[in-house]
Amino acid sequence: FSGSEATAAILSRAPWSLQSVNPGLKTNSSKEPKFTKCRSPERETFSCHWTDEVHHGTKNLGPIQLFYTRRNTQEWTQEWKECPDYVSAGENSCYFNSSFTSIWIPYCIKLTSNGGTVDEKCFSVDEIVQPDPPIALNWTLLNVSLTGIHADIQVRWEAPRNADIQKGWMVLEYELQYKEVNETKWKMMDPILTTSVPVYSLKVDKEYEVRVRSKQRNSGNYGEFSEVLYVTLPQMSQFTCEEDFY
């Protein structure tokens, strides 16, 4: 989970505080509900998810509710408000649409049951940005070595549809990984800011898997990987070698 931990005691501190508060103040046990993740795909909405193991067991804690408070020196002293939407992000979740989301203020969220706080987190939206996967992966052949053993390809993709790249609201950096189909370990390329990259010196007789993920530059975490792109490089005889033209 990205962001700082806090407890209800945060409200007795500086109201703009996002720092950790003594975790000993919590009554949390491993069986009680806990936040598992908050995520914003595009800096304009976010959702938070939690575990709810206890409701599948014998102990009945009562209904789990999420409350949030936001902003700083003024509004922080107001009452906590309940989750605006328990449905849209799935089970055990709360969804904050664009009306409830701003990157310019801190948020604190808490889970309650029977009136007691069981978990609490504080964060800013940029810290929880995890973009959707890049889409439309494809590749083209750049060239083949003189020996016909290796080839270079160019891999291209598009930013996730919901990422506002044009206006610069999101600046994404991408990480491409590739491996031979029968290998287990992925080779990672250095992060780049463009939506295409050459991959050099692939073995011509092998099949490769390529995947790409992205993160907001300077903040947040990498999102999920794209669907795998399969690259099959046929044997040398199937290529027209550029040297044939000289």
């Epitope: 720092q19 664009s98 009306s99 701003s102 310019w104 800013s124």
Partner: antibody, heavy 115, light 108 residues
Framework: EVQLVESGGGLVKPGGSLRLSCAAS????????MDWVRQAPGKGLEWVAE??????????YYAESVKGRFTISRDDSKNTLYLQMNSLKTEDTAVYYC??????WGQGTLVTVSS | EIVLTQSPGTLSLSPGERATLSCTAT???????LNWYQQKPGQAPRLLIY???NLASGIPDRFSGSGSGTDFTLTISRLEPEDFAVYYC?????????FGGGTKVEIK
């Protein structure tokens, strides 16, 4: 009581540099998100930059008009906010306000960029 | 960037009158993220109203705010002599934080 006191303003030539300081008191500075906002003479307000708390990784944000020229920073041990201004232009002439996330404001310090 | 346009540029009124100031955004702003400030000559701006309609600490209740979407309003029910000043709206919802150009409320 929140108090913010800016200093470091003055007259500087185009292309020159200046560092503004803001001494903060009356709140837990290390927990605070801090901003600089400026106001050109007889004009409106323009947000310049923001720096967040250590808990938020001291993340920084800038207006397009100052990106690459201005640097916001802080020293939590001294309860002080800074704005390093390089490659100054005449259009940077303004009163610069230090603010606690635009809720509480200092009295401002005047920066004049002129040859 | 969201541009905030304030109107009128100047409002000439007498003490005791009602003042209505307008702030229009180029695209929708959530009411949670719109503030109003008051600035007197030679002074720093002071937060008046936050989240469209909430009075900041120490602000008298003759000030009120309303609106949603792209249109927001600051109302001063009965102008007091100390209310003659410049008023700015401010959004921090989308894009970078922006301020309106200001409305000057002057004595008629």
């Amino acid at each position: 009581e929140v108090q913010l006191v800016e200093s470091g303003g003055g007259l500087v030539k185009p292309g020159g540099s200046l560092r503004l300081s803001c001494a903060a008191s009356g709140f837990t500075f290390s927990d605070a998100w801090m901003d600089w906002v400026r106001q050109a003479p007889g004009k409106g307000l323009e947000w310049v930059a923001e720096i967040r708390s250590k808990a938020n990784y001291h993340a920084t944000y800038y207006a397009e008009s100052v990106k690459g020229r201005f640097t916001i920073s802080r020293d939590d041990s001294k309860n002080t906010l800074y704005l390093q201004m390089n490659s100054l232009k005449t259009e940077d002439t303004a009163v610069y306000y230090c603010t606690l996330i635009r809720d509480y404001w200092g009295q401002g310090t005047l920066v004049t960029v002129s040859s | 960037e969201i541009v905030l346009t304030q109107s009128p540029g100047t409002l000439s009124l007498s003490p005791g009158e009602r003042a209505t100031l307008s702030c229009t955004a180029t695209s929708s702003v959530s009411s949670s993220y719109l503030n109003w400030y008051q600035q007197k000559p030679g002074q720093a701006p002071r937060l008046l109203i936050y989240s469209t309609s909430n009075l900041a600490s120490g602000i008298p209740d003759r000030f009120s705010g309303s609106g949603s979407g792209t249109d927001f309003t600051l109302t001063i029910s009965r102008l007091e002599p100390e209310d003659f000043a410049v008023y700015y709206c401010h959004q921090y919802h989308r894009s970078t934080p922006t301020f309106g150009g200001g409305t000057k409320v002057e004595i008629k």
